[in-house]
């Protein structure tokens, strides 16, 4: 950066390098050349010459002011005009920065995501602050009152296996950077009651050729957890709103889920579960798509082949569930 | 293009302070760096002091350090040459000069301070 | 402090000779010289800066050259206007110091 340039004297910012978005600031500069008596001193912002509001303050120092400044950075540099030099001399440059204090961290989140090992810790870091702003999760044990404290820039995993205090926990978030320091409210976990199962996936679908055709969903999980809720919602591609079944499911075996759907209309599935009872649920499965056919013939998409269409015959078990009508996102 | 213009010369007894001006034109007094130097009848050219802007002082000749006082006004862009404790061989011609580059590119027309009792 | 010695102290000359004037520093001073002209009752006038570069409006018969303790004043072809005396200086550190000059006369 222009901060590794050798410098011929010195150049500093009123009232720091870092500073609040929307400040007035000063940058000065001072030359200290051999034999050179500056005739001017100029100031660069990202190489361009700036020609107003600058103030020569004595005869080797000159004064840039910026009001308002907004910019999130900005390379600086000042040179002189020396007496018979046909070129400017470079006197120094420094890289300064503006942007805001860290908000509370607020929405703090703690979940285990089944054989990842890791606990994962989120949490809404606010408004965006332009500077560089580092985070510390405190875990603290409720039963050995151990604390342990982790730097991030953003999340945080938290291999399962450091966390030998037993099983309840606190859980905060600092938040830190060069224009102020912020700390969260305390997050009260037990470690049975955040595990969120292995991701449910949608494998294929089909239609079945039958006096009203429906179709059938076929999806699955690898979880080992024996009590699971799920909800699978679904709607047409040109529709904003989604349908929503529950279901309370053992994944024992492939699920099978059936609808009746309107013909010859592009419809789009997705599924998430959570441990039943407990506070957090997966994120929604991708998206997966299916055309209902015109008439009767049997259709099967897979997942990951939008809009293909396959023969074949298949008898399934059904899951079936109740149907409500869904305008939520996803819910953490 | 710099112009220095100096005080007129005077006429001094032994003992007493003596302060010449060199009033600046064409630059601001901020932009120059004023050196002065003065010259004995007959003699040579004697470096006194001035502004050094690699270190951002003003430096004095040894001969000179505790009789000089090199001074400025930027609201007039006028420097001034103060020396006290004159005596005999303090008669000589006083100069202002721009420093430029390592070298006096511009001088003041030269004061003539003569001490005598 | 730097002392500087001039040679010789004066010197007749005609014109239309050449003309060579020798400084030496009692320590290095890189390139850190000028070279002056001063003429009787006249403030001195700058010829030659940094050893060899020629101030602008100087006639190219005058040069410099050297670095380091020994430099040298050039006057290629001496004119009526060159009888002065001639003053060399070091700018490499406080206190900057003269020659004690060399006096070109008419022969």
């Known amino acids: 950066g222009i901060t590794n340039i050798n410098c011929s004297g010195h150049i500093w910012v009123e009232p720091a390098t870092i500073f609040k978005m929307g400040m007035n600031i000063s940058i000065y500069c001072q030359a200290a050349i051999k034999n050179c008596q500056p005739r001017k001193l100029h100031f660069y912002k990202n190489g361009i010459k700036e020609r107003f509001q600058i103030t020569r303050i004595n005869k080797t120092t000159a004064r840039l002011w910026y009001k308002n400044f907004l910019e999130p950075h900005a390379s600086m540099y000042c040179t002189a005009e020396c007496p018979k030099h046909f070129q400017e001399t470079l006197i120094c440059g420094k890289d300064i920065s503006s942007g805001y204090p860290p908000d509370i961290p607020d929405e703090v989140t703690c979940v285990i995501y089944e054989y990842s090992g890791n606990m994962t810790c989120t949490w809404n870091a606010g408004k965006l602050t332009y500077i560089d702003t580092k985070y510390v999760v405190h875990v603290k044990s409720l039963e050995t009152e151990e604390e342990q404290q982790y730097l991030t820039s953003s999340y945080i995993n938290i291999s399962t296996d450091s966390l030998q205090g037993g099983k309840k926990y606190l859980v905060w978030v600092q938040a830190a950077n060069a224009l102020g320091m912020e700390e969260s409210k305390q997050l009260q976990i037990h470690l049975d009651d955040i595990v969120i199962p292995s991701a449910a996936v949608i494998s294929r679908a089909e239609t079945i050729n039958a006096t009203v055709p429906k179709t059938i969903i076929y999806w699955d999980s690898q979880t080992t957890i024996e009590k699971v809720s799920c909800e699978m919602r679904y709607k047409a591609t040109t529709n904003q709103t989604w349908n929503v079944k529950e279901f309370d499911t053992n994944f024992t075996y492939v699920q099978q889920s059936e609808f009746y759907l309107e013909p010859n209309i592009k419809y789009v599935f997705q599924v998430r579960c959570q441990e039943t009872g407990k506070r957090y649920w997966q994120p929604w499965s991708s998206l997966f798509f299916h055309k209902t056919p015109e008439t009767v013939p049997q259709v099967t998409s897979k997942a990951f082949q939008h809009d293909t269409w396959n023969s074949g015959l298949t008898v399934a078990s059904i899951s079936t569930g109740h149907l409500t009508s869904d305008n939520r996102g996803d819910i953490g | 293009q710099v112009q220095l213009v100096q005080s007129g010369a005077e006429v001094k007894k032994p003992g007493a302070s003596m302060k010449v001006s060199c009033k600046v034109s064409?630059?601001?007094?901020?932009?120059?760096?004023i050196h002065w130097v003065r010259q004995a009848p007959g003699k040579g050219l004697e470096w006194m002091g001035g502004f050094d802007p690699e270190h951002g002082e003003t430096v004095y000749a040894q001969n000179f350090q505790d009789r000089v006082t090199l001074t400025e006004d930027t609201s007039t862009d006028t420097s001034y040459m103060g020396l006290n404790n004159l005596r005999s061989d303090d008669t000589a011609v006083y100069y202002c000069?721009?420093?430029?580059?390592?070298?006096?590119?511009?001088w003041g027309q030269g004061t003539l301070v003569t001490v005598s009792s | 402090d730097i002392q500087m010695t001039q040679s010789p102290s004066s010197v007749s000359a005609s014109v239309g000779d050449r003309v060579t004037i020798t400084c030496r520093a009692s320590?290095?001073?890189?390139?850190?010289l000028a070279w002056y002209q001063q003429k009787p009752g006249k403030a001195p006038k700058v010829l030659i800066y940094?050893?060899?570069s020629l101030q602008s409006g100087v006639p190219s018969r005058f040069s410099g050259s050297g670095s380091g303790t020994d430099f040298t004043l050039t006057i290629s072809s001496l004119q009526p206007e060159d009888f002065a005396t001639y003053y060399c200086q070091q700018a490499n550190s406080h206190p900057w110091t003269f020659g004690q000059g060399t006096k070109v006369e008419i022969k």
């Open positions: 940094t050893a060899s």
């Open positions: 000069a721009a420093e430029s580059y390592g070298d006096y590119e511009f």
């Open positions: 320590q290095g001073i890189n390139n850190w």
């Open positions: 064409g630059y601001t007094l901020n932009e120059l760096s």
